[in-house]
Interface confidence: low
Amino acid sequence: FERTRSLQDPCSNCPAGTFCDNNRNQICSPCPPNSFSSAGGQRTCDICRQCKGVFRTRKECSSTSNAECDCTPGFHCLGAGCSMCEQDCKQGQELTKKGCKDCCFGTFNDQKRGICRPWTNCSLDGKSVLVNGTKERDVVCGPSPADLSPGASSVTPPAPAREPGHSPQ
């Protein structure tokens, strides 16, 4: 089948890193500098992504794969394939259109990215506040008075932080 296909379409024999050059009798030519083809049988090579400005190169472009960028310190990636760099804020802040702003009372952010989230409402679980919340930390819920019996656990650990690298888009 491969041989049949290649007789019909000579370009199908061109491997990744090359392109099928119509100007040269459909022979497989290497991708020019700063371009790549990640699959075989391509009729053109793609221009490599360039990591400039706030972007920095995480992986150099090769003839078979695009460059990959990340962000300079003080910024973090957003979007598919780090298509944008967003400014970091301090813990206890969130990024708004006017820059980094402190979390409002009753909310917190324990990361350098993402939004301020409301403190846990301990009373919804019938618990009391053991440790007050801050701009940087959620409240710690403790047992309700009825739970304070010998052998009962004294502290419920706070909810785990959001997985690194994920924040509301």
Epitope: C45, I47, R49, Q50, A67, S83
Partner: nanobody, 122 residues
């Protein structure tokens, strides 16, 4: 001079489909990555999708993945966005944008079209 002209917008019911087109002129279309970007009423710009110069590398925003398909025809200097299973939240002005050649594969744009309005409503 560089020109990008979108067409194909209109009113469509939820669940319906539309195909947007963008006619490019004034530059070597086949050398540039191209994007679709949208702006919902009263909201900021949202990147939707982009396609590499040859069309072999494509990416989508999570909000449209599986519903929208970007494509290009370099012989016709045209970019397309096929939009299926449309939702009310897809209502926006859709812009075709040329990606800045210094920042290929990013959401950095140097030229924009005038936009075409897509309204999804029953």
């Amino acid at each position: 001079q560089v020109q990008l002209v979108e067409s194909g917008g209109g009113l469509v019911q939820p669940g319906g489909s539309l195909r947007l087109s963008c006619a490019a002129s004034g530059f070597t279309f086949s050398s540039y990555w191209m994007s679709w970007v949208r702006q919902a009423p009263g909201k900021g710009l949202e990147w939707v999708s982009h396609i590499s110069s040859s069309g072999s590398t494509i990416d989508y925003a999570e909000s449209v993945k599986g519903r929208f398909t970007i494509s290009r025809d370099n012989a016709k200097n045209s970019l397309y966005l096929q939009m299926n299973s449309l939702r009310a939240e897809d209502t926006a002005v859709y812009y075709c944008a040329r990606e800045d050649p210094r920042m290929t594969g990013t959401t950095d744009f140097d030229y924009w079209g005038q936009g075409t309005l897509v309204t999804v409503s029953s």
